[in-house]
């Protein structure tokens, strides 16, 4: 099943997020992703855990998953590079870089997103944008078109409370509010964009969604700048 959902959001403006990618397994949406360079998409490592025997591809330039759109193109994956420290049983280091079979054809609907290199926490309360094709309600309805939601960043101390994530949020992770509006599971790999810059990637650990006491967890890309640069080099 697809890993992910945007809860409490709405349909995104078509093609206004040219960095948005759909990571697909055997032709079906699996996870979100974000174009960070002409030939590289950043996603979450856990997305490929169950994909050993399947064909992984990346869809760029899409708003609708099913309808024909001039900007849409499906790319094969030349190489999948999970973070070397990612493990199935932990949310830590949940990053994956996918090298496309060729450089993406750039245009208004396909363009890399600048990512944060300054390793500094986003101020609590900052409103950040999350987008994805995951299910949109607890009944499991899957949208055909890209959805998005604005979420406030939550301070790490609150996120680490015993009633919340109980100390699991390291300095390499960040949280956002999850009170009725939320990302979850496999919007996993999708971008958390603050002030027009990629700050976080939705983690793919399983957790209840839309519950204010279980905030959304995002991998801070600035904390992994050296690794990202080394892979893209």
């Amino acid at each position: 099943p697809p890993r992910g959902r945007i809860l409490g959001g709405r349909e995104a403006e078509a093609h206004a997020r040219p960095y948005m990618a759909s990571v697909q397994l055997n032709g079906a949406h699996l996870c979100g992703g974000v174009l960070v360079a002409e030939q590289w998409v950043l996603s979450a490592a856990h997305c490929l855990e169950d994909a050993a025997d399947g064909k992984v591809q990346v869809l760029l330039g899409a708003h609708s998953l099913s309808q024909p759109e001039p900007s849409k193109r499906l790319y094969d994956v030349l190489r999948a590079v999970p973070h070397p420290d990612s493990q199935p049983d932990t949310i830590d280091h949940d990053l994956l870089l996918l090298q496309l079979s060729e450089k993406a054809t750039l245009g208004p609907a396909v363009r890399p997103l600048p990512w944060q290199r300054v390793d500094r926490d986003v101020a609590p309360g900052t409103l950040c944008d999350v987008a994805g094709w995951g299910i949109v309600n607890h009944a499991g309805r899957r949208p055909d078109s890209l959805q998005h939601v604005l979420l406030p960043v939550l301070d790490r101390a609150t996120c680490n409370r015993r009633t919340h994530h109980d100390g699991a949020i390291t300095e390499r992770l960040m949280c956002a509010e999850s009170n009725r509006r939320d990302s979850c599971k496999g919007d996993s790999g999708g971008p958390l964009v603050c002030g027009g810059v990629l700050e976080g990637v939705v983690t793919s650990g399983s957790r209840v969604c839309g519950n204010r006491k279980k905030p959304g967890i995002y991998t801070r890309v600035a904390s992994y700048a050296a690794w990202i640069d080394s892979v893209l080099a």
Epitope: A12, V118, P124, T126, P152, N179, G195, G196
Partner: antibody, heavy 121, light 106 residues
């Protein structure tokens, strides 16, 4: 058409409190954040804070801690801001504002009509 | 917090002139918004995400910049452009505005 209609001018005494309102129309009130901005007489704009009317989640500029409280009433599609312990420094025009698009950026694309608060004995 | 400094505070120009006003941020931001305000009215969105004109804004306006330095340019000033222009950053809470540039037409 999205519209934000604010309550009328207020003349209040120092030390008192005032609650101003912002009634929204033309869109789903619970779908978007409502922000408040202060414009003092030097025409300086100060962001006060926001509220998510759907769940009550709010954030505030620390500068206004203890001064401003933002709330929202879903049933009437109205946002409120209460200002307390008023002094002459609080005399200003207060705006509600929001972003009603669906792009990756957000800005204040709709502003309220403004409420003038005058603090004077 | 990110402090935005606008210059000049007052700009005087004749119709048809090209004018540029600047907004400098105390820390790097990725995009900047601009608003226009005329006396007695609420601010109006004017330029969003650095260079995109809001609905109804004449094409003689343009925005540019990156990092800590942004600008709003009017290629040929007209009388109706007389107003105060404010920049605003949305990269980090608290969201801040510049002190404004008042454009006067000679």
């Amino acid at each position: 058409e999205v519209q934000l209609q604010q309550s009328g001018p207020e003349l209040v005494k120092p030390g008192a409190s005032v609650k101003i309102s912002c009634k929204a129309s033309g869109y789903s009130f619970t779908g978007y954040y409502m922000h408040w901005v202060k414009q003092s007489h030097g025409n300086i704009l100060d962001w006060i804070g926001y509220i998510d009317p759907d769940n009550g989640v709010s954030s505030k500029n620390q500068k206004f801690t203890g001064k401003a409280t933002v709330t929202a009433d879903k049933s009437s599609s109205t946002a409120y801001m209460e200002l307390r312990s008023l002094t002459s420094e609080d005399s200003a025009v207060y705006y509600c504002a929001g972003y009603y698009g669906s792009s990756w950026y957000w800005y204040f694309d709709v502003w309220g009509t403004g409420t003038t608060v005058t603090v004077s004995s | 917090q990110i402090v935005l400094s606008q210059s000049p505070a007052i700009l005087s120009a004749s119709p048809g002139e090209k004018v540029t006003m600047t907004c400098r941020a105390s820390s790097s931001v990725s995009y900047m918004h601009w608003y226009q305000q005329k006396p007695g009215s609420s601010p109006k969105p004017w330029i969003y995400a650095t260079s995109n004109l809001a609905s109804g804004v004449p094409a003689r306006f343009s925005g540019s910049g990156s990092g800590t330095s942004y600008s709003l340019t009017i290629s040929r000033v007209e009388a109706e452009d007389a107003a105060t222009y404010y920049c605003q950053q949305w990269s980090s809470n608290p969201y801040t505005f510049g002190g404004g540039t008042k454009l006067e037409i000679k």
